[in-house]
């Protein structure tokens, strides 16, 4: 085979036209990406065959391998083929596109692989990076193939600079399978036991008929061997189980228990491990913080949650003001303790449509024969404020007074404001705040009382207006953490009988 130009590497201009010729003693054909592009085939008078491939209006996407091979059924040597690599430097093409297959690289052993990020210009400097890092990796680069080396099980990107623009390739993902057609799972009846209790572990293999189990465990290292029992789970095909049973555990039995399984047919092996903790005695431990003051809003439902660790499983009791709580038949209180993992628990007290009487001192106690823990908090019921009364009066002194009374929990703040221009205020003009000590025309007197039985504050505030010369809209606003309420009254001068 004779190729002209001979290559093996050509650099062609973008938008140009280029002609490749291949000739041989038998029919020849040009191939590009496993396909035959349109080409002109001919046979000369001297019996020589040729094929002419004309590349027109070249772009960066024409970069790549071109092969000339014999196109003959006479069974000529298939390795008789010529390879040509063409670059078409094109600033509009960063990295050449990859097929999906090329973005995922799968392997079962440590072997050299190629991350096939390729550019259109052989002069460009290309670097390889882990997707999550900026440091360039010291891996050799071949402009025709990409980066070749031994890669870890990570994701990688290639970078280059075209002009003043940094360009990133697609991400390439290397998947390395630690070969094992044995599927082993290990579990324990309990991973936490008290000394004197039993440790029982099971190692199960699926999909194999002949396997060998080997256990390693803390007791084995001190030369005290335990004989495992192996059985077949007949209700499931090819499920084999090895049971390791250690009666009357000691503190020294804490540690890692490993089940190693081998099968000699394909020389496969797999292992799984589990940690066992032997404790001297049981425990109960609170997890996380719960503030000593908790809040609930009147008539809303509230769930109070305590998270703790315990072994063995504890008894959980809730108290209010030292009286034991239970699920109420009316559905006002719900208690639940959930086991969210082997030794972790969540206990919840739910108050449905909270009432004032449910404020008080709450305690959760979790206990068993070895340990106990308790957690207490005060529950405050927050009550949205409401203005109960807003009244205006004309004492003989000539001044005019407005009295505002309201209740809520926590203690409400009171804000007095007035609109002097009834037509424009409050839509166009903001109300004027009243009761500032600097103002001579109004004086304010506020008293606060805590009502123990209702567990809320009452605020009574009296606003004294020295001289009112035209109608005035006076507004009393009460505000606390869970709401606000407003009422207003029109105050008229003495000289204007209100109609």
């Amino acid at each position: 085979l004779v190729v002209t130009p001979p290559g093996p590497e050509l650099v062609l201009n973008v938008s140009s036209t280029f002609v490749l010729t291949c000739s041989g003693s038998a029919p020849v054909v040009w191939e590009r990406m496993s396909q035959e592009p349109p080409q002109e085939m001919a046979k000369a008078q001297d019996g020589t065959f040729s094929s002419v491939l004309t590349l027109t209006n070249l772009t960066g996407l024409d970069t790549g391998e071109y092969f000339c091979t014999h196109n003959d059924s006479r069974g000529l040597e298939t390795d008789e083929r010529k390879r040509l690599y063409i670059f078409v430097p094109d600033p509009t093409v960063g990295f050449l596109p990859n097929d999906a297959e090329e973005l995922f690289i799968f392997l079962t052993e440590i072997t050299e692989i190629t991350i096939p990020c390729r550019v259109t210009d052989p002069q460009l400097v290309v670097t390889l990076h882990e997707k999550k890092g900026d440091v360039a990796l010291p891996v050799p680069y071949d402009h025709q193939r990409g980066f070749s080396g031994i890669f870890e099980d990570r994701s990688y990107i290639c970078k280059t600079t075209i002009g003043d623009r940094e360009v990133d390739s697609d991400a390439y993902y290397v998947y390395r399978l630690q070969v094992s057609s044995i599927n082993v799972s290990v579990n324990a009846v309990q991973t936490v036991v008290r000394q004197g209790e039993n440790i029982t572990l099971m190692c199960i293999v699926i999909g194999n008929e002949v396997v060998n189990f080997e256990w390693t465990y803390p007791r084995k290292e001190s030369g005290r061997l335990v004989e495992p029992v192996t059985d077949f789970l007949l209700d499931m095909p090819y499920h084999i189980r090895s049971i390791l049973h250690i009666p009357s555990a000691e503190l020294e039995d804490s540690g890692t228990y490993t089940c190693n399984v081998t099968e000699s047919v394909n020389d496969h092996q797999d292992e799984k491990a589990i940690n066992i903790t032997v404790v001297e005695s049981g425990y109960v431990r609170l997890l996380g913080e719960v503030g000593t003051l908790q809040f609930a809003e009147l008539h809303r439902s509230r769930t109070l949650q305590v998270v703790f660790e315990a072994y063995p499983p504890p008894t959980v009791l809730w108290f209010k003001d030292n009286r034991t709580l239970g699920d109420s038949s009316a559905g006002e209180i719900a208690l639940s303790t959930r086991n969210v993992s082997e030794t972790r628990y969540v206990s919840e007290l739910t108050l449905v449509r909270v009432k004032v009487a449910e404020a008080g001192h709450y305690t959760m106690r979790a206990f068993h024969e070895d340990a106990e823990v308790q957690l207490s908090f005060q529950l405050q019921i927050n009550v949205p404020v409401r203005v109960l009364e807003l009244s205006e009066s004309h004492p003989d002194s000539g001044e005019q007074t407005v009295r505002c009374r309201g209740r809520g929990m926590p203690q409400p703040n009171i804000i007095w404001s007035a609109c002097r221009d009834l037509k424009r205020c409050p839509r166009e003009l903001p109300p004027t705040l009243l009761g500032n000590s600097s103002e001579e025309e109004s004086q304010l007197e506020t008293n606060v009382t805590y009502w123990e039985e209702e567990q809320e504050f009452e605020v009574v505030s009296t606003l004294r207006l020295q001289h009112v010369d035209r109608p005035l809209s006076v507004r009393c606003t009460l505000r606390n953490a869970v709401g606000q309420d407003t009422q207003e009254v029109i105050v008229v001068p003495h000289s204007l009988p209100f109609k």
Epitope: R154, S155, V174, Y175, R176, L177
Partner: nanobody
Framework: QMQLVQSGAEVKNPGASVKVSCKAS????????IQWVRQAPGQGLEWMGW????????HSAQKFQGRVTMTRDTSISTAYMELSGPTSDDTAVYYC?????????WGQGTLVTVSS
């Protein structure tokens, strides 16, 4: 800890579809593509295709197009691969895998034996 757990071994007659499941845990299921790969006895790994668990989009290798269907049930964080019209050449261990960026995670593999 990211984990993929596959369904158990299957023995199928030629032509009878096989469906393998892959349950994910320890990470947000929709965050990473699921790849399906197989290894026939004595052969290397062969990529079959990927599934985007977020959108349900799939892309399969040319060799398997029209024969492999990849689906998912996000409510139970499980991906499925169904191979239709299998022949004895499809006897292999089928793996699901995902990549967390810093490393790959694999299911334990499901042995599918196609034999009459």
């Amino acid at each position: 800890q990211m984990q993929l757990v596959q369904s158990g071994a299957e023995v199928k007659n030629p032509g009878a579809s096989v469906k393998v499941s892959c349950k994910a845990s320890g990470y947000p299921f929709s965050a990473y593509y699921i790849q399906w790969v197989r290894q026939a006895p004595g052969q290397g790994l062969e990529w079959m295709g990927w599934l985007n668990p977020n959108s349900g989009d799939t892309h399969s290798a040319q060799k398997f197009q029209g024969r492999v269907t990849m689906t998912r049930d996000t409510s139970i964080s499980t991906a499925y691969m169904e191979l239709s019209g299998p022949t004895s050449d499809d006897t292999a261990v089928y793996y699901c895998a995902t990549h967390g960026g810093d490393r790959s995670y694999w299911g334990q593999g499901t042995l599918v034996t196609v034999s009459s």
